[in-house]
Amino acid sequence: RAPRCRELPAQKWWHTGALYRIGDLQAFQGHGAGNLAGLKGRLDYLSSLKVKGLVLGPIHKNQKDDVAQTDLLQIDPNFGSKEDFDSLLQSAKKKSIRVILDLTPNYRGENSWFSTQVDTVATKVKDALEFWLQAGVDGFQVRDIENLKDASSFLAEWQNITKGFSEDRLLIAGTNSSDLQQILSLLESNKDLLLTSSYLSDSGSTGEHTKSLVTQYLNATGNRWCSWSLSQARLLTSFLPAQLLRLYQLMLFTLPGTPVFSYGDEIGLDAAALPGQPMEAPVMLWDESSFPDIPGAVSANMTVKGQSEDPGSLLSLFRRLSDQRSKERSLLHGDFHAFSAGPGLFSYIRHWDQNERFLVVLNFGDVGLSAGLQASDLPASASLPAKADLLLSTQPGREEGSPLELERLKLEPHEGLLLRFPYAA
């Protein structure tokens, strides 16, 4: 008799794929544009990335460091009107993209939460949650919560408001902290909170260190849903050298939880390559004309247009990973088991019941390595086969779809492999 199928877990929309942050509308759209109407015109691009949610803004009125002139219910006219916002919401809905609104109050000022009048600001946030929920947004983000006194209790209250409206609504909190204990204390009192942090931001050194960080986090958070990013707002290139971007894309898309990216991560957007551009929000490179300041500074392979035409580009990898992440049960909600694969490597299996299983092997080092996969580390339910098919490599040159012998697996410097193999009873 065939074994009984495992019951599928309840899945919220943010469990099904990546979130895409557009913190600066002007930088994202470029060419002196930067409003909600213009963003609506970019929704097809977001659809092509297969992202499930757009984290937008802040876009509310905020006079720098002035509580009285900060109105979370009013859209800054520079970004558009409520009608423009409503139109964006309707269009996003038609494309199955959820809209998450960033309500970080003093986003133009020194302290995101103002240094005084905490209760006044917290009440403003409560009002804004209620107003925008009724206006149709799918969730909220608040950043820099390390600057918010009594953050845990406020987050619990805001979470109650958000979930009280509908269980299908999301609250994201962001912190600059990379300290696991601080992160856990924020998560403790907030069951369904999605937290973005700088926890993984110093993981670029070795595979062992990354493995240790990831497994520690997953063990500490138990069976709660996580999010994966390198920071609450910044680009991957702020933390990673170019050669590790593909590896990290593969990792973020295949860890158990919601991957969260910033606009430009999909093309390796790097402020350092664009003189005069702010580190936190460089202009998005749609094509070679997006950065006219210095002629010739932008080559085609740095842009969305150029990378869209190249199947081997970072953008193409992002699209493929995003597609896999959103349709494979083992990646959507599968169990996770990390195991030893040798120094410099981080490897893990994702599996769900009798569905196709995935093996991820990541070489963080700058030398080629043979993987010594220690299958003995794995539980019986997640045993490794002798061979697995190569779904994709982060490096060119491998024949996709070909079976690889796992005992003889060799990885190039900074290479990541995504392999698939069937369930075997």
């Epitope: 006044t120 600001v121 403003k124 409560k126 209620e130 929920l133 009724q134 149709g136 009280g164 409206f165």
Partner: antibody, heavy 119, light 114 residues
Framework: QVQLQESGPGLVKPSETLSLTCTVS????????VHWIRQPPGKGLEWLGL???????NYNSALMSRVTISKDTSKNQVSLKLSSVTAADTAVYYC?????????????WGQGTLVTVSS | DIVMTQSPDSLAVSLGERATINCKSS????????????LTWYQQKPGQPPKLLIY???TRESGVPDRFTGSGSGTEFTLTISSLQAEDVAVYYC??????????FGQGTKVEIK
């Protein structure tokens, strides 16, 4: 118990500014929003604006350039100002509490105050 | 702005009989986010302020007699008084409280005893 009481001059000259105060008791203005509504004699209700617990304000766009709502939490008072009034602004003016989360319904109303615009 | 239209303008019903008031909105008042319909009913007796009867189209405010029932969804709504009492003589208003302001009222329906 929850109470709201409107007060202000009953007669205002055309082109002047109408100023009304709503004094509340039995609840805190830092926990609840307050709406202003008006009703011309023998006619229906018109929503003017809402001041939220945190101080944000939604106005009726038809009157937006003329209406100002503010509050003094320490005095438990909300005020309404309507500038450049004409005879068409003659009405009973009500303040009412926004009483429910995820709803703009008004669960408690003041008795209303009649304002006549006439020279 | 959402336009609210009530019918009839006035209604005469015998004591103990059913009174039915209709309200139509120019766009749907259903919020797909929480599946609630953002329509409110008020009762205004002569010389008094309005009184909240029903919100979310069908949720009765506490203390409101159960002879008052709200129904409908999308753009068409009904307030039913199952057995009219003398104290129910009043003008009844529907109000949209959906999404963005202004939160507009219907023109009112006057209920009298036949």
């Amino acid at each position: 118990q929850v109470q709201l009481q409107e007060s202000g001059p009953g007669l205002v000259k055309p082109s002047e500014t109408l100023s009304l105060t709503c004094t509340v008791s039995g609840f805190s203005l830092t926990s609840y929003g307050v709406h202003w509504i008006r009703q011309p004699p023998g006619k229906g209700l018109e929503w003017l604006g809402l001041i939220w617990a945190g101080g944000s304000i939604n106005y009726n766009s038809a009157l937006m350039s003329r209406v100002t709502i503010s509050k003094d939490t320490s005095k438990n008072q909300v005020s309404l100002k309507l500038s450049s009034v004409t005879a068409a602004d003659t009405a009973v003016y009500y303040c009412a509490r926004k009483g429910h989360m995820y709803s703009y319904a008004m669960d408690y109303w003041g008795q209303g105050t009649l304002v006549t615009v006439s020279s | 702005d959402i336009v609210m239209t009530q019918s009839p303008d006035s209604l005469a019903v015998s004591l103990g009989e059913r009174a039915t008031i209709n309200c139509k909105s120019s766009q749907s008042l259903l919020n797909s986010g929480n599946q609630k319909t953002y329509l409110t009913w008020y009762q205004q007796k002569p010389g008094q302020p309005p009184k909240l009867l029903i919100y979310w189209a069908s949720t009765r405010e506490s203390g409101v007699p159960d002879r008052f029932t709200g129904s409908g969804s999308g753009t068409e709504f009904t307030l039913t008084i199952s057995s009219l009492q003398a104290e129910d003589v009043a003008v009844y208003y529907c109000q949209n409280d959906y999404s963005y302001p202004p939160w507009t009222f219907g023109q009112g329906t006057k209920v009298e005893i036949k």
